[in-house]
């Protein structure tokens, strides 16, 4: 069948999801597409427990998540409702700051060095986390 009982090589299983943590950086859209080519999505944080898990694995490094407001309202990439869902913004965030001088505001969310969230310029090359649910991935492990 198409369901799997374990995560691909180099992915970490947690609470029926598989997570992959990058060690290099890409712009948010490129990170999003990378995850999509893995039949996954940028990580969607739905609980304090999941927040702690991800934070433990990424350490104190700016890291993209699957949350953005590029089309107006804040949206999770998998359709999880933002308004009623888990949030962990830094104080005063998100602020859509225009003072960075790079043009436009800040439309993409990332984990900061203390794990709390900030909105930032989507073109910044931050690390990223991919997530896929176990019952969505193919059964065969990759060769590598």
């Amino acid at each position: 069948g198409s369901e799997r009982t374990c995560c691909p090589v180099n992915w970490v299983e947690h609470e029926r999801s598989c997570y992959w943590f990058s060690r290099s950086g890409k712009a948010w859209a490129d990170a999003d597409n990378y995850c999509r080519l893995e039949d996954a999505h940028l990580v969607v944080v739905t609980s304090w427990e999941e927040q702690k898990f991800v934070q433990h694995h990424i350490g104190p490094v700016n890291t993209w998540m699957g949350l953005h407001d590029q089309n107006g309202p804040w949206k999770w990439v998998d359709g999880t409702d933002y308004e009623t869902g888990f949030k962990n913004w830094r104080p005063e965030q998100p602020d859509d700051w225009y003072g960075h001088g790079l043009g436009g505001g800040e439309d993409c969310a990332h984990f900061t060095d203390d794990g709390r969230w900030n909105d930032d310029v989507c073109q910044r090359p931050y690390r990223w986390v991919c997530e896929t649910e176990l019952d969505k991935a193919s059964q065969e492990p990759p060769l590598l």
Epitope: R23, D30, N33, D39, K136, P142
Partner: antibody, heavy 121, light 108 residues
Framework: EVQLLESGGGLVQPGGSLRLSCAAS????????MNWVRQAPGKGLEWVSV????????FYADSVKGRFTISRDNSKNTLYLQMNSLRAEDTAVYYC??????????????WGQGTMVTVSS | DIQMTQSPSSLSASVGDRVTITCRAS??????LNWYQQKPGKAPKLLIY???SLQNGVPSRFSGSGSGTDFTLTISSLQPEDFATYYC??????????FGPGTKVDIN
């Protein structure tokens, strides 16, 4: 031996259609995103399209968007490229290539031998 | 889109020569740079990925270096089978992986 084998190329008139196939053997096809890359005669390489391992996500170069459709049948270990509204500038050798993803870096590690598509009246 | 340029566009060399090909990106691509070799009538072959990682089965005379926007492919001692065209490719902008125009290495 890990192998990709393209077929379906040929001569077609402008505005016509063609369907390319790429048969994979000796590797876990469904675990890999697959690409089409083309090379016009005497020219360089141009990425055309990619599809994720389970076929859920697809992407296209602007030059073919709306005209070409990438798909795959994992039960047959086969990748496809449906090419419609063909133009003279689509004339090229078309290669299928698998996506290597290591530590966040990506490359095309396995290539087919290519199939020639000629668009001419 | 990220543009890739290569220099030289062609070069003549002899067996045993040390050959260096450079590749430049129009913006920083970190270490997301691959090198391919292509012989006439054949498919490209991956030599190096992520700037400096040698693909399985590729001879150690091939090496890659660089970061940001400037990258280099070096062949330490050119062999007869190395006469070919070499392409760099950026893999920063997933999935729009643009290639350089190529560098043809032929016999002096």
């Amino acid at each position: 031996e890990v192998q990709l084998l393209e077929s379906g190329g040929g001569l077609v008139q402008p505005g016509g259609s063609l369907r390319l196939s790429c048969a994979a053997s000796e590797f876990t096809f469904s675990s890999y995103a697959m690409n089409w890359v083309r090379q016009a005669p005497g020219k360089g390489l141009e990425w055309v399209s990619v599809i994720s391992g389970r076929g859920i996500n697809t992407f296209y170069a602007d030059s073919v968007k709306g005209r070409f459709t990438i798909s795959r049948d994992n039960s047959k270990n086969t990748l496809y490229l449906q090419m419609n509204s063909l133009r003279a500038e689509d004339t090229a050798v078309y290669y299928c290539a698998s996506r290597l993803a290591v530590a966040g870096s990506e490359a095309f590690d396995i290539w087919g031998q290519g199939t020639m598509v000629t668009v001419s009246s | 889109d990220i543009q890739m340029t290569q220099s030289p566009s062609s070069l003549s060399a002899s067996v045993g020569d040390r050959v260096t090909i450079t590749c430049r990106a129009s913006q920083s691509i970190n270490n997301y740079l691959n090198w391919y070799q292509q012989k006439p009538g054949k498919a490209p072959k991956l030599l190096i990925y992520a700037t400096s990682s040698l693909q399985n089965g590729v001879p150690s005379r091939f090496s890659g270096s660089g970061s940001g926007t400037d990258f280099t492919l070096t062949i330490s001692s050119l062999q007869p089978e190395d006469f070919a065209t070499y392409y760099c490719q950026q893999s920063y902008s997933t999935p729009l992986f643009t290639f350089g125009p190529g560098t043809k290495v032929d016999i002096n």
